[in-house]
Amino acid sequence: QPDAVNAPLTCCYSFTSKMIPMSRLESYKRITSSRCPKEAVVFVTKLKREVCADPKKEWVQTYIKNLDRNQMRSEPTTLFKTASALRSSAPLNVKLTRKSEANASTTFSTTTSSTSVGVTSVTVN
């Protein structure tokens, strides 16, 4: 049996043009599903907002390395994959689409879910 068949899929259709202050970030997700138009990083802010960022940008690569290091320092075993609702208020400066697919993204976080706003949800067959 495939794992987590109905896990949500987050897709990014555009990236933030602004560099987010590192101090505002709590976690990130890697988006790699072939159902999405491009690979992406979704940063989750401390206010539970989700921001799509270009994983090729040097600042994005630096930020996710810092988040990885901080994550390991704070709680080494709390990495988990997204299988619940998106943890977000309306995403910043981006279009973010939700679809249903097994293990669409990998989340790096220590916090629990909050209500998702302004994100469409469709089922992919």
Epitope: T32, S34, P37, K38, K56, D68, Q71, L79, F80
Partner: antibody
Framework: QVQLVQSGAEVKKPGSSVKVSCKAS????????MHWVRQAPGQGLEWIGR????????KFDPKFQGRATITADTSTSTAYMELSSLRSEDTAVYYC??????????WGQGTTVTVSS | DIQMTQSPSSLSASVGDRVTITCKAT??????LAWYQQKPGKAPKLLIS???SLETGVPSRFSGSGSGKDYTLTISSLQPEDFATYYC?????????FGGGTKVEIK
């Protein structure tokens, strides 16, 4: 659906060069990195290097720096890997793969390169 | 460069067995570890990324764990289609490096 289709098998003489192609469909190669990995007969996997097709920037394992060249043609969604000064130890299956994060979720079928006099 | 040491290099097991493969990095790779399965004459197939995250369509009998320098791939109940060679790979820093592989054979 993402698909990577590689060019056919090659037999080369020592000292010569080989150029392997990898045509991508189902994705815009400008949005990812294209990597090259090789596997000698009965051996493990070895990363050669990668290209950012959007700007042509490359990164190599120091072992291949200067001998490997990776290029990409975004108009045809094709990545290329050329290896020069071939020796018998370069006999291997060469794979292209995609992945912006450094792991590889889609792979080509592999191209066998045999270096023999 | 970060070296990856995989063990065992080969193992014999029966259908239904629980199989564990380990991978050790020469430095902390902060969970940036991938596991691949490769069958003869085929390209590797990504099973797990980020040390624990199962790829789409990969059966739940596969799981990954670990942190820091030490990581594990577990197959909870070996199936006939699981006989293959498994590789770990670190993607913390380039050059990206693979473990030497573990061949899982039929006992």
């Amino acid at each position: 659906q993402v698909q990577l289709v590689q060019s056919g098998a090659e037999v080369k003489k020592p000292g010569s060069s080989v150029k392997v192609s990898c045509k991508a469909s189902g994705l815009n190669i400008k949005d990812t990195y294209m990597h090259w990995v090789r596997q000698a007969p009965g051996q493990g996997l070895e990363w050669i290097g990668r290209i950012d097709p959007a700007n042509g920037n490359t990164k190599f394992d120091p072992k291949f720096q200067g001998r490997a060249t990776i290029t990409a043609d975004t108009s045809t969604s094709t990545a290329y890997m050329e290896l020069s000064s071939l020796r018998s130890e370069d006999t291997a299956v060469y794979y292209c793969a995609r992945g912006v994060f450094g792991f590889f979720d889609y792979w080509g079928q592999g191209t066998t390169v045999t270096v023999s006099s | 460069d970060i070296q990856m040491t995989q063990s065992p290099s080969s193992l014999s097991a029966s259908v239904g067995d629980r199989v564990t493969i380990t991978c050790k990095a020469t430095e902390d790779i902060y969970n940036r570890l991938a596991w691949y399965q490769q069958k003869p004459g085929k390209a590797p197939k990504l099973l797990i990324s980020g040390a624990t995250s199962l790829e789409t369509g990969v059966p739940s009998r596969f799981s990954g764990s670990g942190s820091g320098k030490d990581y594990t791939l577990t197959i909870s109940s070996l199936q006939p289609e699981d006989f293959a060679t498994y590789y770990c790979q670190q993607f913390w820093s380039a050059p990206y490096t693979f473990g030497g592989g573990t061949k899982v054979e039929i006992k």
